[in-house]
């Protein structure tokens, strides 16, 4: 059977957590990705983000997660309205933020 | 030192409102990561939960009992208050308040407790 | 709302058996499970949280176990201290419930 909303959203959370606890070398060799608007539309749009980044097996799991919550295919290169324009921060600090907002979603019981 | 003490009427009559105050000792709830839970102990039985709050303010009820609880807090007074309006005997208990931490994975384990403050609803 | 069920309801050991109380959770709740030590007349304290990790100053004896819906508290070599009566709590989802608690005596 499909996994509550919630439990997927807890799992998500979980995986942001064990990335930013284990961190030893830059993550992601310090690639850069767009900054996005949290307010709206998030799941998507940290995906349309983190896509861009290859190659990099500590995110790969956060990609699959990220997917299984954006209703539409998304593939690189591909920018929604919800970036913010020409902000570029750290796969680390992008996760850090995303973390922060999604524990508030979590906590506020909105996982859909 | 980590503490929490609810304060509370003792006695209150059925259809009134009843207010409960916890204060904080040895930690803020301005703190991120921090937040408090109410629960509560009829004479005999077991622990049911009610009411909890965040440090961002983000509150969360029992659905049994949220018409009729307010769960809130005055950082400055280090203070979170519950209100329980149409009190019944049934809400005869000890009410305690405990403290949650979150830190990396939403735990919801209540760490540190209150002593427990006797509320007795009857005419 | 996610149902604990508690066993034994209460139980009676002599000081240095091995007592291990069960819980059951109505739907998997992902280790999220915390154990509560409450003495006569005393609030209740945190003895073990996600399934079986400690807070500092909890004894070695208190261990927890288990996974999905099932969960076990075990005290390896019962005290007289340890008189009490013993809560679990799911912290997956709210809202926050509490088994129905095994009150352990001395024989």
């Known amino acids: 059977s499909p996994v509550p909303r919630s439990t997927a959203l807890k799992e998500l959370i979980e995986e942001l957590v064990n990335i930013t606890q284990n961190q030893k070398a830059p993550l992601c060799n310090g690639s850069m990705v767009w900054s996005i608007n949290l307010t709206a539309g998030v799941y998507c749009a940290a995906l349309e983000s983190l896509i861009n980044v290859s190659g990099c097996s500590a995110i790969e799991k956060t990609q699959r997660m990220l997917n299984g919550f954006c209703p539409h295919k998304v593939s690189a290169g591909q920018f929604s309205s919800l970036r913010v324009r020409d902000t570029k921060i750290e796969v680390a600090q992008f996760v850090k933020d995303l973390l922060v907002h999604l524990k508030k979603l979590f906590r506020e019981g909105r996982f859909n | 030192e980590v503490t929490l003490r609810e304060s509370g009427p003792g006695l209150v009559k059925p259809t009134q409102t009843l207010t409960l105050t916890c204060t904080l000792y040895g930690f803020s709830l301005s703190t991120s990561d921090m937040g408090v839970d109410w629960i509560r102990q009829p004479p005999g039985k077991g622990l049911e939960w009610l009411a909890h709050i965040w440090w961002d303010d983000v509150k969360r009820y029992n659905p049994a009992l949220k018409s009729r609880l307010t769960i809130s807090k005055d950082t400055s007074k280090n203070q979170v208050v519950l209100k329980l309006t149409s009190v019944d005997p049934v809400d005869t208990a000890t009410y305690y308040c405990?403290?949650?931490?979150?830190?990396?994975?939403?735990?919801?384990?209540?760490?540190?407790w209150g002593q427990g403050t006797l509320v007795t609803v009857s005419s | 709302d996610i149902q604990m069920t508690q066993s034994p309801s209460s139980l009676s050991a002599s000081v240095g058996d091995r007592v291990t109380i069960s819980c059951r959770a109505s739907?998997?709740?992902?280790?999220?499970l915390n154990w509560y030590q409450q003495k006569p007349g005393k609030a209740p304290k945190l003895l073990i949280f996600?399934?079986?990790m400690k807070p500092r100053g909890v004894p070695s004896r208190f261990s927890g176990s288990g996974s999905g819906t099932d969960y076990t508290l075990t005290i390896s070599s019962l005290q007289p201290e340890d008189i009490a009566t013993y809560y679990c709590q799911q912290g997956n989802t709210l809202p926050l419930t509490f088994g129905g608690g095994t009150k352990v005596e001395i024989k």
């Open positions: 996600y399934t079986s």
């Open positions: 405990a403290r949650t931490v979150s830190s990396g994975y939403i735990y919801y384990a209540m760490d540190y």
């Open positions: 739907q998997d709740i992902r280790n999220y």
